[in-house]
């Protein structure tokens, strides 16, 4: 005998389906027969393969009870049926969506729904003629009404709503409606009245108007000087580009999609043209000055500055500077010269009255007191005085009075007031020229003379001998002069050229070792005796490693 399929159960219920699960019976069989009842009383039968352990009944009606029988079959034999009874889920009912005006810029929604555990309601509001303008709102599931503010005046809207219950959406309900017509404008006022601009303020209900249209008339000529349209969200606008000391009529209209309100007007007189003031000169130097002035913080286009020598009206220079500036540096002036400086502002094509002031530049910076000291056969020291903080550099030129030597030029930092001049021949007369250099000036040159001392005769070393020559070293010996010397300087260099090497030894020594030589190279060696600043004539010789 065939045994009954085991543990038939409903594992999942939905509005239009039931999911069945069961276990296979022990006895061998060919197939299953599944029968279920419809709400009409009819039975529907389905044949299933023997390896089936689950089945979904689809296309059922929501909120209905179904009887299910499952039988195992072999040939003409049938098992006893396994039975289960289950109901599909109710479709939560969401009904009676009504939309009423909530003022001219909003809507009130009401709906009815079963008191099921709705999680949320999702609402969409969009202009009937513009699906791009959709706004979504999600509200708690316990609500049955919602206010939708901030909509356009006198506009058709489509409102849609669905509920979310047990994590699933209900069908959508929709309705069409329109917002109310526009209310009137409030009042219009002016603020921050300047000489060329003012601020217009007004009141109006939020969201009522698409735009505002503003007209500005000059009262005396009744000419329209400005027409402008501003967005409906604004309640204030700046009106620039007006004339100073002029009476204006300003008219405001609210504009919706299809009509304009009655106009509101206001009359206003602009301020007088502003004045420049407080012209002063600071930081007067020998070649320039800084001009300062004050004015109201208005939109000056630019300022025009004129600088002219008081005694030479031909020599005038003009410069134009941005309207944001309140100071300007005027360079390139003459030292110790009286000047007249004038300025006027340009604002909206108007010139302010001119302001002037008189000023004199400082005296030109100077250098002087060029002195020579510490003279030796080969060098001397120079010192001089100069105006502090002016000079970038000093130029020193040294010329021998016989014009036999090349002119030597030295550039010294502007902070220095001394210089050591060396490498000169003894017993020679020199002329020294000094000039100071600043960014826009080179001073007059000052000069002095200097004569290097005579060289006292000093005996040279004698008889250079090379001994103990190896690949990379050699000993050099000499005979000292009769007069006592402080030191000997030995210079050696490959005869083919290169960097000379130098060794200085005590004046009591008569030989030294030359090291770090290059194998197989001929070296030229020169030895001089030294005492103080004096040097002897050299004695030379050569050797090969």
């Amino acid at each position: 005998e065939l045994d009954t399929p085991k543990d038939l159960q409903v594992s999942e219920t939905a509005e239009t389906s039931l999911t069945l699960l069961w276990k296979t019976p022990l006895a061998k069989f060919d197939r299953y027969r599944l029968n279920y009842s419809l709400p009409t009383g009819q039975w529907v039968g389905v044949q299933l393969p023997r390896n089936t352990t689950s089945y979904v009944l689809r296309g059922l009606e929501p909120g209905q009870e179904y009887n299910v029988l499952l039988t195992a079959e072999k040939g003409r034999h049938k098992s006893k049926p396994a039975r289960v009874k289950a109901s599909t889920e109710e479709v939560p009912s969401l009904e009676n969506l009504t939309v009423t005006e909530a003022g001219w810029d909003g809507l009130r929604l009401n709906w009815t729904a079963d008191d099921l555990a709705y999680e949320y309601f999702v609402i969409q509001v969009q202009e009937a003629n513009n699906v791009e303008t959709a706004h979504n709102f999600t509200v708690p599931g316990n609500l049955r009404a919602a206010d939708i503010p901030g909509l356009k005046v006198a506009t058709s809207y489509r409102v849609s709503i669905y509920g979310v219950a047990r994590g699933y959406r209900t069908p959508v309900l929709s309705a069409e409606t329109s917002t109310g017509t526009t209310p009137n404008l409030g009042e219009v006022t002016v603020a921050e009245v300047g000489w060329d601009a003012l601020t217009l303020n007004w009141t109006a209900p939020e969201g009522a108007y698409k735009n505002f249209f503003i007209q500005v008339l000059e009262a005396d000529t009744t000419q329209t000087v400005q027409n402008l349209t501003v967005p409906g969200g604004l309640r204030s606008v700046d009106l620039p580009g007006l004339k100073a000391a002029t009476r204006y009529y300003i008219t405001l209209r609210g504009v919706t999609q299809d009509f304009g309100t009655a106009p509101l007007s206001v009359e206003v007189l602009t301020e007088d043209l502003p004045q420049l003031g407080g012209l002063s000169v600071t930081e007067v130097s020998w070649d320039g000055l800084t001009l300062n002035w004050t004015t109201d913080d208005l939109a000056y286009k630019h300022f025009v500055v004129q600088v002219q020598e008081a005694n030479n009206v031909e020599a005038a220079q003009n410069l134009t500077v941005p309207g944001s500036l309140r100071a300007v540096d005027i360079p390139g002036l003459k030292a110790d010269t009286p000047y007249r400086v004038s300025i006027y502002g340009v604002i909206q094509g108007y010139r302010t009255p001119m302001l002037s002031t008189d000023v004199s530049t400082a005296r030109e910076p100077e250098i002087g007191n060029l002195n020579v000291s510490d003279v030796t056969p080969k060098s001397f020291n120079l010192s001089w005085t100069a105006t502090d903080g002016i000079f970038d550099m000093f130029t020193i030129e040294i010329i021998d009075s016989n014009r036999l030597l090349q002119t030597a030029e030295h550039n010294i930092s502007g902070a220095e007031r001394t210089a050591h001049i060396s490498g000169l021949p003894p017993s020679t007369d020199f002329i020294v020229y000094l000039s100071g250099i600043a960014p826009s000036i080179r001073t007059k040159t000052i000069s002095t003379t200097a004569t290097t001392e005579a060289l006292t005769a000093m005996g040279s070393p004698k008889e250079v001998i090379f001994s103990d020559i190896t690949e990379n070293s050699a000993t050099v010996s000499w005979r000292a002069p009769t007069a006592q010397v402080e030191s000997f300087r030995i210079t050696y260099v490959p005869i083919t050229g290169g960097t000379p090497s130098m060794v200085t030894v005590d004046g009591t020594k008569t030989q030294t070792r030359l090291v770090k030589l290059i194998p197989g190279v001929e070296y030229l060696v020169s030895i001089i005796a030294m005492k103080g600043f004096e040097e002897s004539e050299p004695v030379s010789g050569s050797f090969t490693t």
Epitope: E15, S17, P140
Partner: antibody, heavy 118, light 108 residues
């Protein structure tokens, strides 16, 4: 125009967790639904779950229940998806997306690559 | 969870062809269905929502139909830009739901 900007790529060890952020700009963040969708290399799209920031309650796909946590911070307009007990098969590009009224995902983030490797 | 089955998984077609992709839900989802297009390395793009509503900016050659458990996406005249993978998604689940396994439309 809504824009969704996601945090950068992550490399994680098996067993660890990853938290991906999604910052929204444009539109009213709290009133729309944010969903998280992933796509493993060469595979299809998988919806993981979603949240309505205004309520802070999240719904998850059965497959990810217990392993994924979706949250939202209304003050910064940022949604977060945290996936725990990572395994190599969680290697995927994770997207956040905004749902429209009908549930269609009309705006998407640029995607965040999460690699799970020992 | 509601299961979504898409067919075919791959579809070879030529420019100008009329292409139809089918999506079947494991239970009735009314018209809560969306279709997406995805190109390699890019995020999906919404084409159709509410089974038949065309998303703003999507060419009119794309259309959707169906309700309950059977749905189709039709491309009336395939363009070079349309070679991509297409996914259906049920939205009966809130806030969103399961995707089909995808249909790759490739050049014949």
């Amino acid at each position: 125009q809504v824009q969704l900007v996601q945090s950068g790529a992550e490399v994680k060890k098996p067993g660890s967790s990853v938290k991906v952020s999604c910052k929204a700009s444009g539109g009213t963040f709290s009133s729309y639904a944010i969903s998280w969708v992933r796509q493993a290399p060469g595979q299809g799209l998988e919806w993981m779950g979603g949240i309505i920031p205004i309520f802070g309650t999240a719904n998850y796909a059965q497959k990810f229940q217990g392993r994924v946590t979706i949250t939202a911070d209304k003050s910064t307009s940022t949604a977060y998806m945290e996936l725990s007990s990572l395994r190599s098969e969680d290697t995927a590009v994770y997207y956040c997306a905004k749902g429209n009224f009908y549930g269609g995902l009309d705006y998407w983030g640029q995607g965040t690559t999460v690699t799970v490797s020992s | 969870d509601i299961q979504m089955t898409q067919s075919p998984s791959t579809l070879s077609a030529s420019v100008g062809d009329r292409v139809t992709i089918t999506c079947r839900a494991s239970q009735s989802i009314s018209s809560w269905l969306a279709w997406y297009q995805q190109k390699p390395g890019k995020a999906p793009k919404l084409l159709i929502y509410d089974a038949s509503s065309l998303e703003s900016g999507v060419p009119s050659r794309f259309s959707g139909s169906g309700s309950g458990t059977e749905f189709t996406l039709t491309i009336s005249s395939l363009q070079p830009d349309d070679f991509a993978t297409y996914y259906c998604q049920q939205n009966k689940k809130f806030p969103s739901g399961t995707f089909g396994q995808g249909t790759k439309v490739e050049i014949k």
